[in-house]
Interface confidence: low
């Protein structure tokens, strides 16, 4: 018969024959001949091959370097990569995840807008009119101005996006 | 709205060394993101080369580790890339761009300054 | 590193024709993103995280895909839809584009 020009699916032409793809997790170590199967061999135990393939060689599992701030979110297996992830308080430079960064925290006069995940950083926004921080923080909000005024208070110093308003008593109405 | 521009030479000598600055306007890039470039060569193909972090970490690809380097000026709102000894094969399009991560795509590119390395 | 591999290199499409346009990576990667190209500017955010629309992109505009085959489709061939796009992908370091599919107007 005529030597095949193409292969079907999971197969690779070599030496004018079609031989089997190694399944996913499983090295070449041999191609087929007109005699034999292709030979294929388990990947290590800190490697891995996700793809039907005809690798000699298979990748090394991604190491979470805890120096970096990462540690596993998903131990690899002989068919998928490790998933790593950010230490808490910490979040991933980019979506491959090889390095992370501090959360921020907000300065006084800034809260937090939304709080910080394993892959974004805190946001801040500025306190408005009527609102404060005074604390350096990744996890508070602004805080409103205390309300003088259900308390039977008045003000005695404004606030400020950094400071609360400070009240005290009115002033008696002689008679 | 962020905008980002590149600049520098348009010509370099073979063996030199090529420097690139990005002026971010409308945004600080000490706030947060990752910042990057990108280069495309005379084919159309195009290289990511690596980013400098809101904090100031840098990635580099692999593939240029030996000769690159980015830096910044936090005042100017800039920051830079340096690319040592310089071939012919250096000849392209550089661009910079934001990684808005967990969007997770370059949401805004430069314009792009053109490169063109020859004696 | 991933490779990723654009086809077809370049097609021609008639106005109102579909159109898909495919990805393949060489790893399994987590999602796909695609930028357009016209001659003379930078590239432009168009579909990310597979299948999401960036803002201003008509809704003739769809993305799918997983692992390691992706795909762009355009439902109906449109003259403003001729251009170079390219994908690209972060799911493994270092970050890779695709060599980009030029569609022309027919």
């Known amino acids: 018969p005529e030597p095949p020009t193409a292969c079907r699916e999971k197969q690779y032409l070599i030496n004018s024959q079609c031989c089997s793809l190694c399944q996913p997790g499983q090295k070449l170590v041999s191609d087929c001949t007109e005699f034999t199967e292709t030979e294929c061999l388990p990947c290590g135990e800190s490697e891995f091959l996700d793809t039907w393939n005809r690798e000699t060689h298979c990748h090394q599992h991604k190491y979470c370097d805890p120096n970096l701030g990462l540690r596993v979110q998903q131990k690899g297996t002989s068919e998928t990569d490790t998933i790593c992830t950010c230490e808490e308080g910490w979040h991933c430079t980019s979506e491959a995840c090889e390095s992370c960064v501090l959360h921020r925290s907000c300065s006084p006069g800034f809260g937090v807008k939304q709080i910080a995940t394993g892959v974004s950083d805190t946001i801040c926004e500025p306190c408005p009119v009527g609102f404060f921080s005074n604390v350096s923080s990744a996890f508070e909000k602004c805080h409103p101005w205390t309300s003088c005024e259900t308390k039977d208070l008045v003000v005695q110093q404004a606030g400020t996006n950094k400071t609360d308003v400070v009240c005290g008593p009115q002033d008696r109405l002689r008679a | 709205d962020v905008q980002l521009q590149e600049s520098g030479p348009d010509r370099v000598k073979p063996s030199q060394s090529l420097s690139l600055t990005c002026t971010v306007t409308?945004?600080?890039?000490?706030?947060?993101?990752?910042w990057h470039w990108i280069r495309q060569f005379p084919g159309n193909k195009l290289e990511w080369m690596g980013y400098i972090y809101s904090s100031g970490h840098t990635y580099y690809n692999p593939s240029l580790k030996s000769r690159i380097s980015f830096t910044r000026d936090t005042s100017k709102n800039q920051f830079f890339l340096q690319l040592n000894s310089v071939t012919t094969e250096d000849t392209a399009t550089y661009y910079c761009a934001i990684y808005y991560y967990g969007r997770s795509y370059f949401d805004n590119w430069g314009r792009g300054t053109t490169l063109t390395v020859s004696s | 590193q991933i490779v990723l591999t654009q086809s077809p290199a370049i097609m021609s499409a008639s106005p109102g024709e579909k159109v898909t346009l495919t990805c393949s990576a060489s790893?399994?990667?987590?999602?796909m993103h695609w930028y357009q190209q016209k001659s003379g500017t930078s590239p432009k955010r168009w579909i990310y995280?597979?299948?999401k629309l960036a803002s201003g992109v008509p809704a003739r505009f769809s993305g799918s895909g997983s692992g390691t085959s992706y795909s762009l489709t355009i439902s109906s061939m449109e003259a403003e839809d001729a251009a170079t796009y390219y994908c690209?992908?972060?799911?493994?370091?270092?970050?890779?584009f695709g060599a980009g599919t030029k569609l022309e107007l027919k």
């Open positions: 690209q992908q972060w799911s493994s370091n270092p970050l890779t």
């Open positions: 409308g945004y600080s890039i000490t706030s947060d993101y990752s």
């Open positions: 995280d597979t299948s």
């Open positions: 790893s399994s990667v987590n999602y």
